[in-house]
């Protein structure tokens, strides 16, 4: 028996359902009584879900997994993982045994989009050219860690005096805070770009500093 899985990692958004595809080619006359199917975590060998002795043995993994019982006889051994969490990320191995056995691993990459950045300025009044200001760009509840980039109004990247920190909350999602320290010119626009490297999702924030009231 030959087991086939997706070459590419499966990307799943937090709180959505993911399907880890696994298939085999059943011989003519194949019946489910012959099938032993085991899904396990590749690294720890922890059992996730199994189908043995002709029946679904159920989820051994936080009761959030399911097979596709009507499709098993056609060789579809895929696993459904419900309400995906950050902690589900990793490699899963699909073992199929009929007369002989084969296995293959599929990677699950968990992701969550970042919120539109909020911009804060310190100090935020009585600003004059030549003043040193601190601009903070904050974006929330994303996964995995973001990449943060700053640029000025002409689109020139700003890499000096940038400090970016990322903190994971109890769900494993990151809040990112990036601080740019800059000396004000007469007028200036400063933009931050928060990029999710897995979703390839960009979130933009900017602040324009003029002689007039600030605009965000």
């Amino acid at each position: 028996v030959e087991v086939q899985v997706s070459e590419d990692p499966v990307v799943a958004l937090v709180d959505t359902d993911a399907t880890l595809r696994c298939s085999f080619s059943p011989e003519p006359g194949f019946s489910l009584a012959q099938l032993n199917l085991i899904w396990q975590l590749t690294d720890t060998k922890q059992l996730v879900h199994s189908f043995t002795e002709g029946r679904d043995q159920g989820s051994a993994y936080s009761n959030r997994t399911a097979l596709f019982p009507d499709l098993l006889v056609q060789g579809n051994a895929s696993l459904r993982l419900q309400r995906v969490r950050v902690t589900d990320e990793g490699s899963y191995t699909c073992f199929v045994s009929i007369q002989d056995f084969d296995s293959a691993a599929v990677s699950l990459q968990v992701a969550a989009p970042y919120s539109k950045p909020s911009m804060t300025l310190e100090p935020n009044k009585d600003l004059r050219p030549g003043n040193m200001v601190t601009i903070t760009c904050s974006s929330y509840q994303g996964y995995p860690e973001a990449e943060v980039f700053w640029k000025d109004g002409q689109g020139v990247p700003l890499t000096g005096n940038v400090t970016t920190s990322q903190m994971a909350n109890e769900r494993g999602l990151f809040d990112v805070h990036s601080v740019l320290r800059v000396v004000l010119g007469a007028n200036g626009t400063y933009s931050c770009l928060v990029r999710n490297p897995v979703l390839q999702q960009d979130a933009h924030g900017s602040v324009t500093i003029t002689g007039q009231p600030l605009t965000f």
């Epitope: 990449e147 990247p157 940038v162 400090t163 490297p197």
Partner: antibody
């Protein structure tokens, strides 16, 4: 100015190990992702691995997964590549590169040559 | 993780314009606007010429420009000069935060 300097390359037997280092200066190292890219003699560029600014997220090319480990020490502004179970096909110049511009490697080190003899 | 496809060589006379193509799939070039281009002279480290399809870093000549259509990205060098003779590589994000390079193109100034 931004500078990256690699070290640790050399000649190693097939199956052996080597640890490459990349010392960074001129930018806030901990705020940016870093990559290793390699180039076999007379061949093209091949991406090897990337690590996030804090070191919490790491990704690898299939060709090195399970054998190479990328890491960083932000207190020392240094990037590392631990290479185990080396093969002849790992022979290459290894470059470290910074991601201080979106989606690209804007600053590169001078490279360090790793030669794996069989 | 197959390499992106580039022509092995492109040549032009001084002052001419040349274009280098970089063809991938919807899983890399076609799927994201994160294509970058690098110039590499013999024995030297690569140098970033274009990022995010069509953005030029400061210090890179205006003669270099990038574009993308579907699964193919392009680098155009206008007003070709002797110092442009080098190898050029495209690169793209691909699935799950991985990256992939092109096969490389040798540019010859006739």
């Amino acid at each position: 100015q931004v500078q990256l300097v690699e070290s640790g390359g050399g000649l190693v037997q097939s199956g052996g190990s080597l640890r490459l280092s990349c010392a960074a200066s001129g930018f806030t190292f901990s705020s940016y992702a870093m990559s290793w890219v390699r180039q076999a003699p007379g061949k093209g560029l091949e991406w090897v691995s990337v690590i996030s600014g804090s070191g919490g997220s790491r990704y690898y090319a299939d060709s090195v997964k399970g054998r190479f480990t990328i890491s960083r020490d932000n207190s020392k502004n240094t990037l590392y590549l631990q290479m185990n179970s080396l093969r002849a096909e790992d022979t290459a110049v290894y470059y470290c590169a910074s991601h201080t511009i979106p989606g690209a490697w804007d600053v590169w080190g001078q490279g360090t040559l790793v030669t794996v003899s069989s | 993780q197959s390499a992106l496809t580039q022509p092995a060589s492109v040549s032009g006379s001084p002052g001419q314009s040349i274009t280098i193509s970089c063809t991938g799939t919807t899983r890399d070039v076609g799927g994201y606007n994160y294509v970058s281009w690098y110039q590499q002279h013999p024995g030297k480290a690569p140098k970033l010429m274009i990022y995010d399809v069509n953005n030029r870093p400061s210090g890179v000549s205006y003669r270099f420009s990038g574009s993308k259509s579907g699964n193919t990205a392009s680098l155009t060098i206008s007003g070709l000069q002797a110092e442009d003779e080098a190898d050029y590589y495209c690169s793209s994000y691909t699935t799950s935060s991985r990256r992939v390079f092109g096969t490389g193109t040798k540019v010859t100034v006739l």
